[in-house]
Interface confidence: low
């Protein structure tokens, strides 16, 4: 059915960058200014996204593809397709409703975005603290006395940081 319909439908011949213009006997017309169609056979063109204010244009709109935005310096993207821009903070801080706040003691943030995370608890793995944590850096766990046999690695790297809201695999 789908194949039969497309053979009969003159709009199916309209390529990306055009629309099937019912006002002109279903002739393929170029998309009007500031609009695009990314697939063929469309009866309308979509309005181009405008990257205004805190958004800036990463990729210009063309007749066949929408504009893509990113954020001006001092901000970073959030959401699918950079639907929001969120203020950056310094390393060692997190963004709260009242602005950027330093990480509480016992937590750190080594990025300009995201939340402060607790330092790794070395003792849970039977390790000891080799390098103390700071607001910007996690602790570095050292070996337990039992690990100091010849050939053993002397430092265990910290667990990889996880993005907030992601559960471990």
């Amino acid at each position: 059915f789908e194949r039969t319909r497309s053979l009969q439908d003159p709009c199916s011949n309209c390529p990306a960058g055009t629309f099937c213009d019912n006002n002109r006997n279903q002739i393929c017309s170029p998309c009007p200014p500031n609009s695009f169609s990314s697939a063929g056979g469309q009866r309308t063109c979509d309005i181009c996204r405008q990257c205004k204010g805190v958004f800036r244009t990463r990729k210009e709109c063309s007749s066949t593809s929408n504009a893509e935005c990113d954020c001006t310096p001092g901000f970073h993207c959030l959401g699918a397709g950079c639907s929001m821009c969120e203020q950056d903070c310094k390393q060692g801080q997190e963004l709260t409703k009242k602005g950027c706040k330093d990480c509480c003691f016992g937590t750190f943030n080594d990025q300009k975005r995201g939340i402060c995370r607790p330092w790794t608890n070395c003792s849970l793995d039977g390790k000891s603290v080799l390098v103390n944590g700071t607001k910007e850096r996690d602790v570095v766990c050292g070996p337990s006395p039992a690990d100091l046999s010849p050939g053993a690695s002397s430092v265990t790297p910290p667990a990889p940081a996880r993005e907030p809201g992601h559960s471990p695999q």
Partner: antibody
Framework: QMQLVQSGAEVKKPGASVKVSCKAS????????LHWVRQAPGQGLEWMGI????????TYAQKFQGRVTMTRDTSTSTVYMELSSLRSEDTAVYYC????FGSGSFDYWGHGTLVTVSS | QSVLTQPASVSGSPGQSITISCTGT?????????VSWYQQHPGKAPKLMIY???NRPSGVSNRFSGSKSGNTASLTISGLQAEDEADYYC??????????FGTGTKLTVL
């Protein structure tokens, strides 16, 4: 940089056809429209039509319907404008111009091609 | 489709401001914010000066500005300079997916 290079001047007899070319460079050819605009000696600008460089679809000014054909060759980034059944009043400079995408304007223009129709 | 109406000529002295009008209908100038203005020196191709009613492309002097009210668009040139002497054309997108130019205005700098 962005360039639209047009073919050279032509002299034609009434009733003949002329085909003017416009080679684009310096931008992604298939992402933009190209327009054709003409200007008779001492007269104003006259919009003739638009071609979508990727799909090849066209829209022509009503005045030129049936006499003008716009085509493109994506392999050479070239658009063509053919005008048939020439008459003396078609004597003009013919310009190709890029459609400034996201806007109803023409941001880059070719240098123009003079077509003279004379018996 | 009919052309947009512009005054045939305007003039001004260096340093003065001048305004060129461009009158259409609700199917073109009044219906869309897609009015543009072009400057053309003798023997040269037109150059885009204003697009989308009031936006200046990079490289165009901020002495050039555009506006629109109803079916009439306007181009204002302030601090007139000798090199501004040229022909000026407006253009608009139309409801029939076509474009239309104005009749053209000759600007003379006295």
């Amino acid at each position: 940089q962005m360039q639209l290079v047009q073919s050279g001047a032509e002299v034609k007899k009434p009733g003949a056809s002329v085909k003017v070319s416009c080679k684009a460079s310096g931008y992604t050819f298939t992402s933009y429209y190209l327009h054709w605009v003409r200007q008779a000696p001492g007269q104003g600008l006259e919009w003739m039509g638009i071609i979508h460089s990727s799909g090849g679809s066209t829209t022509y000014a009503q005045k030129f319907q049936g006499r003008v054909t716009m085509t493109r060759d994506t392999s050479t980034s070239t658009v063509y404008m053919e005008l048939s059944s020439l008459r003396s009043e078609d004597t003009a400079v013919y310009y190709c111009a890029r459609g400034y995408f996201g806007s109803g304007s023409f941001d880059y223009w070719g240098h123009g091609t003079l077509v003279t129709v004379s018996s | 489709q009919s052309v947009l109406t512009q005054p045939a000529s305007v003039s001004g002295s260096p340093g003065q401001s001048i305004t060129i009008s461009c009158t259409g209908t609700s199917s073109d100038v009044g219906g869309y914010n897609y009015v543009s203005w072009y400057q053309q020196h003798p023997g040269k191709a037109p150059k885009l000066m204003i697009y989308d009613v009031s936006n200046r492309p990079s490289g165009v002097s901020n002495r050039f500005s555009g506006s629109k009210s109803g079916n009439t668009a306007s181009l204002t040139i302030s601090g007139l300079q000798a090199e501004d002497e040229a022909d000026y054309y407006c253009s608009s997108y139309t409801s029939s997916s076509t474009y239309v130019f104005g009749t053209g205005t000759k600007l003379t700098v006295l």
